[in-house]
């Protein structure tokens, strides 16, 4: 969490951002909130990116002002116009690219004063893993698949019954480049599993951590998946 203040004490407002991550090819949100003003026409929002000459986005007098917008963000940005009046300056970024990663500044001007805060934005790819029984294998085998990851993640298997066990000798993980030549499909196979035990396939890179669980019993297969973004620090 980054909280920024204006330069002069009497004319400063608090601006708060949250470090976040974008999934390439999908839409992302750069979060920023500020002390709201009564009049929308008195609020100016500027989003800037370190190393980029033009603006990422500008909103003033109740509407977008994109004449100074940098080419790399053309047609890809929007604020939540109806929420600006309540202090939401968050930016929606369409079709996130790897190159969108970096340090952003959310700069706010209102009738109360000015304020800004920086935001670290990471980009990569992350997806939910699905763990299934592999029926093509000769022994009791599980197969964990996740369609899109970048950078290359680590894959670790764990089990509820054998807590702390190292499954690296009885598992095999492969990474297959997807058609756009950036993200990769993750496939990990775990051999010699037993019933009535919950197995977890944990995939992690510096952006996200995802877990797929499976438990096979005589009467059913229970599955659960979970994905968590890392380093979502507020400032």
């Amino acid at each position: 969490l980054i909280i920024g203040f204006g330069i002069s004490g009497r004319h400063s407002i608090t601006v708060t951002t949250v470090a976040s991550a974008g999934n390439i090819g999908e839409d992302g949100i750069l979060s920023c909130t500020f002390e709201p003003d009564i009049k929308l026409s008195d609020i100016v929002i500027q989003w800037l990116k370190e190393g980029v000459i033009g603006l990422v986005h500008e909103f003033k007098e109740g509407k977008d002002e994109l004449s100074e917008q940098d080419e790399m963000f053309r047609g890809r940005t929007a604020v939540f116009a109806d929420q600006v009046i309540v202090g939401n300056a968050s930016l929606r970024l369409k079709n996130v690219q790897l190159t969108d990663a970096g340090t952003y500044k959310c700069y706010i001007i209102t009738s109360k004063g000015k304020g800004n805060a920086n935001l670290e934005y990471k980009t990569g790819a992350f997806s939910m893993p699905e763990v299934n029984v592999d029926y093509n294998a000769s022994s009791e085998t599980l197969r964990c698949e996740a369609p899109r990851w970048f950078p290359q993640p680590t894959v670790v298997w764990a089990s509820q019954v054998d807590q702390g066990a190292n499954f690296s000798e009885v598992s095999n993980t492969s990474f297959e480049l997807n058609s756009e030549n950036v993200t990769m499909k993750v496939v990990s196979v775990l051999y010699n599993v037993t019933i009535n035990n919950t197995y977890s396939c944990m995939i992690e890179n510096d952006i996200a951590k995802a877990t797929g669980d499976i438990k096979v019993t005589e009467s059913e297969i229970k599955r659960r998946s979970h994905l968590q973004l890392l380093n979502s620090k507020a400032s």
């Epitope: 029984v133 029926y135 009791e140 019933i195 096979v216 019993t217 005589e218 009467s219 059913e220 297969i221």
Partner: nanobody, 122 residues
């Protein structure tokens, strides 16, 4: 209550054929893989064949491949084992059983019927 009732066994000459049936009740048949297991009198049980819930995937123990065919009729909650080219070593009590997956370790199976005896002899 899970019930599995096997039928269709009998005495057959070597090279002959039989069709075993297993009528299932007490559970949602289409949620389960169905398996055939056999037991030679005085010996342990041996897995024979399996079929997926929708019938699209089947597999067999090596010694019966090409001779036995597993099938199922989900409308009738019944699984079948068609046996051709029977040999003396196929003599056994045949059981059907269910499991949530295609895994087929004998110790995983919990529900058994009374079995049906197949005797191959001249």
């Amino acid at each position: 209550e899970v019930q599995l009732v096997e039928s269709g066994g009998g005495l057959v000459q070597p090279g002959g054929s039989l069709r075993l049936s297993c009528a299932a009740s007490g559970f949602t048949f289409t949620d389960f893989w169905m398996h055939w297991v056999r037991q030679v009198p005085g010996k342990g049980r041996e897995w024979v064949s399996r079929i997926s819930p929708d019938g699209s995937s089947t597999s067999y123990e090596d010694s019966v491949k090409g001779r036995f065919t597993i099938s199922r009729d989900n409308a009738k909650n019944t699984v079948y084992l068609q046996m051709h080219g029977l040999r003396a070593e196929d003599t056994a009590v045949y059981y059907c059983t269910r499991f949530s997956t295609g895994w087929h370790r004998i110790e995983y199976f919990q529900h058994w019927g009374q079995g049906t005896l197949v005797t191959v002899s001249s």
